[in-house]
Each structure stands twice: as C-alpha cells, then as structure tokens.
C-alpha cells in the first residue's frame, strides 16, 4: 500500500499553563531526509495551521520564533508541544506529516488528538 | 477572496519556450503547495508539477521533466511555470491548483490556453 | 504510480435519478488520500469530496463519497440539472499524482 500511517494519541488534557504534549508517530514507506510536520486544528468543518517545521532526519525540529509550538524529533517520531492554550482552544489537533525528500513524496495524516484545555480558576484575594 | 488567476498562454510553435504564470490571494502563500495541472482539448485531467512551500522542493510528472520548471516568489504572491522544448502534445489548458490543508486541490483558477502549432 | 480506472464511461440519467460512480485503484490507496471533482464545460474542475467520504466547503448532501483500498464510489443522491458534467477521481498520497480519467453524466 503506497500510504504513510500517522499515529497520535486520541486525547490529551492540556496543563493548567495550557500546555498540551503529545507524540505523533509516522510509518515511512521510504527513506527521508527532510520531513514537513503541521499541526492542523479542526473545528467544525473547518481546519486551520496551527504551525509547520521543516527538518533534516537525524536534525532537530525548528518552528518559526513566533510560534505556539515547539518539537523534538526521534527516528520517525515527533514530539510535539503546543503552548499558550485557553479553554477557547478545545478541539481536534491534527499531525499531518510529509516526506518531501528525496523523491517519492508521501503524505500522512493522523486521526487527531482531542485538545481539551481547562481555564484555571482566578486565585481568590486572601486577607492576610 | 482566495483565488488563483493563471496567464501567460497562448500560441507557440514547436520547439519554442513560453512562461505562464499564477498570481494568487486571500491566502497565506508561502503556507500551501500548488500543482500545475493540465487538459488537452477533449481530454481529462494530467498533474504537471508541484511546488512546495519555500519553493526548494519540486516534483514534475516524467512527460515534462527536464523541459518544464517550476518556481514560485512568495513576496508577490505568484508562481511560474517555465516550458521549453514545446511539443505539440503539450497543447492544453493549463490550472494551477492549491494544495489544501488536508492535501487535496481545493482552489483552482480559471486556467490559461496553451497551444503548440507550427 | 497508482492508476485509478473510473466507470463507467458516460452515464445517462434523469433528474432526480440517483448517480452511482466508480473508481478503481491498481493499488491500496488510503480513504484519506481519494479526491473527487466535477468539471463543467469551459470551467476549472471542483473539489467535491476528500478524504474518500468528506464534503468540500459548499458541496450539498446529495453528493457523498464511499469506500476504501481499492475501491471508491461517488453517488449523487438525486440528480439537479446542475449536476451534469464530468466527475474525476484522483489521489494525493503519494507521488506522481494520479486522476482518472473521468466519467461523464449526461442528461438521458
């Protein structure tokens, strides 16, 4: 089967910092050595970048300053961190990854992984 | 809106070069891949090329290889298809497609005319 | 490369008729990868489904996607006069990208 697998947990619950982490695993048909990694949302029906990094296999994974995410990569495993999360930002996380090179490219797209993030309580002021 | 605007087709003789070109908008370029695909007169559907991202990786369908090149400049929004060695078989209408978040083409352009006659 | 054989060649229907389309793969192509687009007369082609079972932005409920592996089905519910044109399916999970070579629904 020409198709690249993507495995990534079904559900995360993210910190009280809204900090989310989790693994996403690709099955490559073949031998790359550059990787595209994007996180996708999807609400709805509607799906949006979250954020995207390229990266050199056996090189770590670099996002763009300015990012939420941040990523450490193993072998055909990713480690993926997503920062910065509000309730607001519940929803399905998608690891999309591609084998850009050398040729054939491939695609790969997970199942998702729940997000679900939980505003903290304010702490209440305390008389002391 | 998020739209794909082709040019550059027109008549050429066997043998010759012609440049096309797709200008897109309302969307973040340098964040999708776009494919040239074309159709020859009464024809289905033949991929040509694709362009990624940052522009460094490209693949073309082995019809067009070492004829064809594709590059794009994420500063104005446009891509380009370069054509030489112009075949008669290369007559068609030429689409630029966008690459969608999930990998399937879900915005084209109208497409531009491209016809190799002596 | 995956070669994809749509059938059949033409179809001639009514309105309101229901349109069953076929796309077969010369290998396993994961349902996430299958495409589906319409094309009229003089227009670029549509995406009407991806992911083999998923509705573009815009696409109504009467067309819907089906299966996996080999084998992949479009169906139009009950035929609108607007449906007649060419339908194609293709796949992006690999390259070189691959399109069928259509199958034409035409008004009987």
């Known amino acids: 089967c020409k198709a690249m697998h993507v495995a990534q947990p079904a559900v995360v619950l993210a910190s009280s910092r809204g900090i989310a982490s989790f693994v996403c695993e690709y099955a490559s048909p073949g031998k790359a050595t550059e990787v595209r990694v994007t996180v996708l949302r999807q609400a709805d029906s509607q799906v949006t970048e979250v954020c995207a990094a390229t990266y050199m296999m056996g090189n770590e994974l670099t996002f763009l300053d300015d990012s939420i995410c941040t990523g450490t990569s193993s072998g055909n495993q990713v480690n993926l961190t997503i920062q910065g999360l509000r309730a607001m930002d519940t929803g399905l996380y998608i690891c999309k990854v591609e084998l850009m090179y050398p040729p054939p490219y491939y695609l790969g797209i997970g199942n998702g992984t729940q997000i679900y993030v939980i505003d903290p309580e304010p702490c209440p002021d305390s008389d002391f | 809106q998020v739209q794909l605007v082709e040019s550059g087709g027109g008549v050429v003789q066997p043998g010759r070069s012609l440049r096309l070109s797709c200008a897109a908008s309302g969307f973040t370029f340098s964040s999708y891949g776009i494919h040239w695909v074309r159709q020859a007169p009464g024809k289905g559907l033949e991929w040509v090329a694709v362009i990624w991202y940052d522009g460094r990786n490209k693949y073309y369908a082995d019809s067009v290889k070492g004829r064809f090149t594709m590059s794009r400049d994420n500063s104005k929004n446009t891509l380009y298809l370069q054509m030489n060695s112009l075949r008669a078989e290369d007559t068609a209408v030429y689409f630029c497609?966008?690459?969608?978040?999930?990998?399937?083409?879900?915005?084209w352009g109208q497409g531009t005319t491209v016809t190799v006659s002596s | 490369e995956i070669v994809l054989t749509q059938s059949p060649g033409t179809l001639s229907l009514s309105p309101g008729e229901r349109a069953t389309l076929s796309c077969r793969a010369s290998?396993?192509?994961?349902?996430?990868?299958l495409a589906w687009y319409q094309q009229k007369p003089g227009q670029a082609p549509r995406l009407l489904i991806y992911g083999a079972s998923s509705r573009a932005t815009g696409i109504p409920d009467r067309f819907s996607g089906s299966g996996s592996g080999t084998d992949f089905t479009l169906t139009i519910s009950r035929l609108e006069p607007e449906d007649f044109a060419v339908y194609y399916c293709?796949?992006?999970?690999?390259?070189?990208?691959?399109f069928g070579q259509g199958t034409k629904v035409e008004i009987k």
């Open positions: 293709q796949q992006y999970g690999s390259s070189p990208w691959t």
């Open positions: 497609a966008r690459v969608g978040l999930l990998g399937a083409m879900d915005v």
């Open positions: 290998q396993s192509v994961s349902s996430s990868y």
